[in-house]
Amino acid sequence: GSERTCCPVNWVEHERSCYWFSRSGKAWADADNYCRLEDAHLVVVTSWEEQKFVQRHIGPVNTWMGLHDQNGPWKWVDGTDYETGFKNWRPEQPDDWYGHGLGGGEDCAHFTDDGRWNDDVCQRPYRWVCETELDKASQEPPLL
């Protein structure tokens, strides 16, 4: 595939990545799928600077990121190592709370109103952020 050298229309470039900020809400799986269809992934926060950048754009609104523990351990959707990476959980989180009465615990991570992270029921319709890296080979077939 061809390399992406600039961000798509309506995406924001920052530190060699492109970001798209939703203005509607979807369940985590639907948001994840939306990003994949855009040849991207739910945002993966790897640094202080990236946290600050995303936080500024989303404002004080619950917003999905690409972090979940639906299969056991916490995992980033792009394979970034969770254990050694940047974390910004709210105090006492993640807590896999079962008291919401919706069945099961809380397996998907989102930004809260102050930017720190919380785990929540994956079916909640939160906003989301897609991210794709520049200089990454795109999945589109080359034009003949």
């Epitope: 202080w48 600077e49 600050k52 950048f53 974390k87 910004n88 105090p91 102050d114 930017g115």
Partner: antibody, heavy 118, light 107 residues
Framework: QVQLVESGGGVVQPGRSLRLSCAAS????????MHWVRQAPGKGLEWVAI????????YYADSVKGRFTISRDNSNNTLYLQMSSLRAEDTAVYYC???????????WGQGTTVTVSS | DIQMTQSPSSLSASVGDRVTIACRAS??????LNWYQQKPGKAPKFLIY???SLQSGVPSRFSGSGSGTDFTLTISSLQPEDFAIYYC?????????FGGGTKVEIK
Amino acid sequence: QVQLVESGGGVVQPGRSLRLSCAASGFTFSSFGMHWVRQAPGKGLEWVAIIWHDGSNKYYADSVKGRFTISRDNSNNTLYLQMSSLRAEDTAVYYCARDLSMGGMDVWGQGTTVTVSS
Amino acid sequence: DIQMTQSPSSLSASVGDRVTIACRASQNIISYLNWYQQKPGKAPKFLIYTASSLQSGVPSRFSGSGSGTDFTLTISSLQPEDFAIYYCQQTYSTPLTFGGGTKVEIK
């Protein structure tokens, strides 16, 4: 009331070690990140280090990286700064401060003085 | 590292004057800029966060503005207790960095 009290400062020879403590009271210590900031005599403020509320992230100024270690004991409401391989340029008043939203410092201690001299 | 440059380094003003202090970042820090006040022999006091938000308990004569690389702290009507050193600080990127300070003295 919300209070931070530093201790552990003193006169130390170059190359030696020192551990500073910061005792917190009046707030839920385990819910806040914490900083160390220093101020050399007659100079401005220099950030030293930050530790997350749960210890999950730690960041340091380049000038102290590899020599200083920030840590905390949430059960005792105490923040620490272990300083080793001390240099004359580490001479300063050291303040601990409570973090507000990754970087802001909304509550400060009164400071403890570290003098590195032979 | 992001360098923070304050100007002027010192200024003389009278009670009641409007005072403006500038802070410039060496790169875009969006609005992640804080202001502190420090009096001799005392710890700094938090005044303003994210460029323009007034910390609780800080008098409304203090205000902040700016985004990107250029920021301003304004004291609308200087009071006797405002004579101090003022520092800006960026929190967009580590290492966190402070400006060199602006000393506000009595004329």
